[in-house]
Interface confidence: low
Amino acid sequence: FSGDGRAIWSKNPNFTPVNESQLFLYDTFPKNFFWGIGTGALQVEGSWKKDGKGPSIWDHFIHTHLKNVSSTNGSSDSYIFLEKDLSALDFIGVSFYQFSISWPRLFPDGIVTVANAKGLQYYSTLLDALVLRNIEPIVTLYHWDLPLALQEKYGGWKNDTIIDIFNDYATYCFQMFGDRVKYWITIHNPYLVAWHGYGTGMHAPGEKGNLAAVYTVGHNLIKAHSKVWHNYNTHFRPHQKGWLSITLGSHWIEPNRSENTMDIFKCQQSMVSVLGWFANPIHGDGDYPEGMRKKLFSVLPIFSEAEKHEMRGTADFFAFSFGPNNFKPLNTMAKMGQNVSLNLREALNWIKLEYNNPRILIAENGWFTDSRVKTEDTTAIYMMKNFLSQVLQAIRLDEIRVFGYTAWSLLDGFEWQDAYTIRRGLFYVDFNSKQKERKPKSSAHYYKQIIRENGFSLKESTPDVQGQFPCDFSWGVTESVLKPESVASSPQFSDPHLYVWNATGNRLLHRVEGVRLKTRPAQCTDFVNIKKQLEMLARMKVTHYRFALDWASVLPTGNLSAVNRQALRYYRCVVSEGLKLGISAMVTLYYPTHAHLGLPEPLLHADGWLNPSTAEAFQAYAGLCFQELGDLVKLWITINEPNRLSDIYNRSGNDTYGAAHNLLVAHALAWRLYDRQFRPSQRGAVSLSLHADWAEPANPYADSHWRAAERFLQFEIAWFAEPLFKTGDYPAAMREYIASKHRRGLSSSALPRLTEAERRLLKGTVDFCALNHFTTRFVMHEQLAGSRYDSDRDIQFLQDITRLSSPTRLAVIPWGVRKLLRWVRRNYGDMDIYITASGIDDQALEDDRLRKYYLGKYLQEVLKAYLIDKVRIKGYYAFKLAEEKSKPRFGFFTSDFKAKSSIQFYNKVISSRGFPFENSSSRCSQTQENTECTVCLFLVQKKPL
């Protein structure tokens, strides 16, 4: 016996957030892993007084304590519908079924005399049917339904007389069923029997307040278990060759402060006072944990030396329950002021350390849903995924000897103090129906798949590829709005006077009269800010730099009456100096952010994008920029993420759609202007960039979620892409969905009707497709009332806690970008695509491993899209160059321009043009690499500042 559980709270220093196996492990369980599912008799059998069954303490408790529930009479009616339970088991494909025998169904008054024939027949039929199906029964003798007669006559488990009566009952079960049962559980979760049955009064028999009674009950339960184990070991094991244990339940707990020894001590006490209370005598040294003996000496019974010897080792494996009953409501004593946690992996590690690495059967695990949830129990899938992932990690990474897993529960049923207000079944049962059909929930489909695959196969992503992007691929970095410096920061050479420094006197500079020096014209390098930009860009080794102009700075009045020439000169410098380094610019004309619309003040006050005239003002601004910078800039983005302006114009759906309409018109007017007036001489390309996260159904077994995922893409991307890339009008699916909600009185939104002239104006006004892609969203359908864009979509998002995520909860799901690229091509044809922003926030200020991981994985998927799917991907712009103070850390550089290690990683990918085979040449011909920049530099020299 080792007893070293407290070591679990000393955190593993090797934990790395980007080793995804430490978050979610794609692997299989051991070959002979034991997959099962469980029920409790009282919860599902129903027929509480049918065919001679006696009342249990719970039948009585329900009538006396749970006023709004009259009985478990109906429940799922497993006693009547045995065949339906067997069909459900067949559907899932389990290796074992864990169920409990109702003591009062066999012996109505608890005393072992002649068994109730109908009860005996029921369990015998069930066992025969399981054996026939090759499903191993795991049978629990006592899952809380003590015969009422024993409670009334003896005071239940408070009286040690029950120990022998329980042993008689167990003996009978071994005799009658032992030929077909190889796994026995004596008692299910004795902690709850004692604590809630006699302490809080929340469970039958509903006694409360007497701490001595609580620990007496616990004592008798342990002794009863031990007696039965010895009985089985001596009289039945030799010929039945089975195993026997007791299911012990627990919560898990984390210290408030992971370094604080007092908090860690409290966590240990918390686990010991719940799990250790029963585990220590049985799996440990045969006695109660030392901490309990000291603290509870006045109420905790004492084991004699002989009893300790008798208790010790009375379990053939560690049966562990980890579910809501141990978490809600968790008494304050057990919490010890620390943080309750659902980390099953850590709980298993604690058991390993505390009880010398026993073989473990997870005898109950699962969570619950609200009773209104029927078959689409999406959150249950994610809870199961999380728990199973933790079990797999415990087996594969921590070498914990878990040999089986019991999903809880097979059926919806009576859930103790929660009665019928929650559901825990993998099969839905309508308790008010007569036939009590078992309808598989999403979680049943999911568990079935897990069992079939014996774990988690990595189906989502294909293996990494080796290969390279083309020589003309744009390797970029994106920056948001560059605020122009109003005056060159360095006045050097612009002042013609000579000065002498009075170093010994007043330490001032004195002008030397009569001397005039030669000055020189202003230079781009006079702007300190530009120097910083160029230094960062040079270190990035990118070929392209995407940044945004500040419309409000260039045209403070919103029209051409007052042009800020200094701002234009600043931007021209950024572009021209970049070109000298071989870095071309992709310039964004308008980059609104949530906090600041970035519009010139007069336009903002004239209702901004709700006013159609803003589109005309934008056209004039775009024309100015094309004219002033277009000789140097060959890639233009008119508007960044217009589909995200719904975050700002969100007073109503009609505001959102109206603003979006004006943004589309603004873009189209700018594109038409470029096409007509500037393209012939400048030969550039113009588009707008859309926020384009991918969407997956949160619940892949629910049709409504698949439809919601497609609807998300329609409302998010097609909303702008369809009018520009394809038809000149909004997506039919989006229009129809909003209209149908309108008809049903669920929304007063309506998409604007476009005139034929507007359709002609919009259609085809893109030279390439520009997408900002960051993550994949898991979406579910939820009918929402209200007249806002967000509610018009009828979509809710789900955060998958098993996924690697950033501090702002962006999930790292690389394969989403490949799916997005294929979807765009399928819907809008084979066009040039640029990923104009893609990145993740990472807390690290130096070694930003999450960003490196993200870049490597996402670029792999983009490469697959290029090599395998033949998508015309032309460029990837990592987001973003430098982080901003007190904003999520997306930058390759800190806000004070310190470089992070992801820069070298990106450098390497750029210099290799992807992920080449060993020894393959990554060089492109010199002419290909430099043609564009030679032309650019020639232009730079010809154009005056």
Partner: antibody, heavy 124, light 109 residues
């Protein structure tokens, strides 16, 4: 406070159809544990159960009268309606609606609240 | 169909105990409910699920159920207890509500 109130015609002619309405208050017909039954009692005779509707809209009818009865509910109006076709003088009775509190299954703990009843006479 | 049989009448002196029976095939496996109906009034539930009393019903009313007979017992009978009493079950197999024929309790004197 839970109440049920029956309403309908006092007099119907033989072969006609009787429509009775039970308006409930103090509980919802959507409540998973509530059902409503119709019961009648001819003058001086015993109670006779006619039909029952569950919260999930399942229905159950007396075997002897099944072909003549239709029970339905309008949750938004908190009403349960019984339609009985082809009325006959032997159908003269006081008609009651009563709430049943359903337990875990479709069994229930009796009819805990009754309406005051409405008397229907069938005569030409 | 399932039939519940009650004696048409039971008489008892005030202060004595009245027992009203309700017979049915294996009625012990059903939940039995009892109603009291006074002239001109709607029935009132007095015992449900064999032996439980709704709030407001005196402790004098109790019930039992086993084998083929369920019994309503009224101890210390009062004049105000005079009424018709009906037993009722929800017969699970046929999925029907069944009432007994009713018993008229007469309080003598």
């Amino acid at each position: 406070q839970v109440t049920l109130k029956e309403s309908g015609p006092v007099l119907v002619k033989p072969t006609e159809t009787l429509t009775l309405t039970c308006t409930v208050s103090g509980f919802s017909l959507n409540n998973a544990r509530m059902g409503v039954s119709w019961i009648r009692q001819p003058p001086g005779k015993a109670l006779e159960w006619l039909a029952h509707i569950f919260s999930n809209d399942e229905k159950s009818y007396s075997t002897s009268l099944k072909s003549r009865l239709t029970i339905s509910k309008d949750t938004s109006k908190s009403q349960v309606v019984l339609i009985m076709t082809n009325m006959d003088p032997v159908d003269t009775a006081t008609y009651y609606c009563a709430r049943s509190v359903v337990t875990g299954g479709y069994y229930y703990d009796g009819m805990d609240v009754w309406g005051q009843g409405t008397t229907v006479t069938v005569s030409s | 169909s399932y039939v519940l049989t009650q004696p048409p009448s039971v008489s008892v002196a005030p202060g004595q105990t009245a027992r009203i029976t309700c017979g049915g095939n294996n009625i012990g496996s059903e939940s039995v409910h009892w109603y009291q109906q006074k002239p001109g009034q709607a029935p009132v539930l007095v015992v449900y699920d064999d032996s439980d009393r709704p709030s407001g019903i005196p402790e004098r009313f109790s019930g039992s159920n086993s084998g083929n007979t369920a019994t309503l017992t009224i101890s210390r009978v009062e004049a105000g207890d005079e009424a018709d009493y009906y037993c009722q079950v929800w017969h699970g197999n046929s999925d029907h509500v069944v009432f007994g024929g009713g018993t008229k309790l007469t309080v003598l004197g």
